[in-house]
């Protein structure tokens, strides 16, 4: 059936970049300016996406493919095909409806986008805090407190065989 239809349907011969013009005896006409058809056999061309305002053009529209947008500096893409632009913030901040706000104490964000996340709880892994967290950086967990005997360096050299009573790290 498909082969029969293609033999009878002159529109199936219209390549990408054209449309089957019913007003002109189903002749293949080029897509008008600012429109495209990405597949053959189309009866209309699609309007090109316009990248304006918060959007800027990453790839121009052609007769066979749509324009592609990204976001103007200061904003970043969200969604499939950069359907939205969202404001950048500084590291140590997150975006809210009130704009960019500093991360609360105990949370951090090391990127220009996304939300503030809680610092790692080192004690859950039986470790101690080696470097304190900031708004921009997570804490760095170090050896377990048991491994740090009084006066011992926090960066320990290769240890000799463990004494009885010490559990492995």
């Amino acid at each position: 059936f498909e082969r029969t239809r293609s033999l009878q349907d002159p529109c199936s011969n219209c390549p990408a970049g054209t449309f089957c013009d019913n007003n002109r005896n189903q002749i293949c006409s080029p897509c008008p300016p600012n429109s495209f058809s990405s597949a053959g056999g189309q009866r209309t061309c699609d309007i090109c996406r316009q990248c304006k305002g918060v959007f800027r053009t990453r790839k121009e529209c052609s007769s066979t493919s749509n324009a592609e947008c990204d976001c103007t500096p200061g904003f970043h893409c969200l969604g499939a095909g950069c359907s939205m632009c969202e404001q950048d913030c500084k590291q140590g901040q997150e975006l809210t409806k009130k704009g960019c706000k500093d991360c609360c104490f105990g949370t951090f964000n090391d990127q220009k986008r996304g939300i503030c996340r809680p610092w790692t709880n080192c004690s859950l892994d039986g470790k101690s805090v080696l470097v304190n967290g900031t708004k921009e950086r997570d804490v760095v967990c170090g050896p377990s407190p048991a491994d740090l005997s009084p006066g011992a360096s926090s960066v320990t050299p290769p240890a000799p065989a463990r004494e009885p009573g010490h559990s492995p790290q």
Partner: nanobody, 123 residues
């Protein structure tokens, strides 16, 4: 077709005032957060202010608080930005934008914006 068209820009002296307008068409204006953003010459885009669907929530970037007022008229499908006590650093192209469907829930993306209107503050 969804469209936003800004107007009202121009040349104004420091300390002066301007009122920008944004005419919306092709969508249910009263269902969306609306936003003003601006781009100063040679700078990145900056969020200026936003307003929720019924106008009961309004937020501003610190640098314009107390000087700029965002408002909307849902009956006229219009968004406004009243700018008072203008400064040289307010010189920019101002864009009106529509918040995405999930704006204020998890993301703060804008899915449509206009061509912009130019504001120049100079003596």
């Amino acid at each position: 077709e969804v469209q936003l068209v800004e107007s009202g820009g121009g040349l104004v002296q420091p300390g002066g005032s301007l009122r920008l307008s944004c005419a919306a068409s092709g969508f249910t204006f009263s269902s969306y957060w609306m936003i003003w953003v601006r781009q100063a010459p040679g700078k990145g885009l900056e969020w200026v202010a936003n307003i929720n669907q019924d106008g009961s929530e309004k937020y501003y970037v610190d640098s314009v608080k107390g000087r700029f007022t965002i408002s909307r008229d849902n009956a006229k499908n219009s968004l406004y930005l009243q700018m008072n006590s203008l400064r040289a650093e307010d010189t920019a192209v101002y864009y009106c934008a529509r918040g995405g469907d999930d704006y204020s829930n998890s993301h703060y993306g804008m899915d449509v914006s206009g061509q912009g209107t130019t504001v120049t503050v100079s003596s």
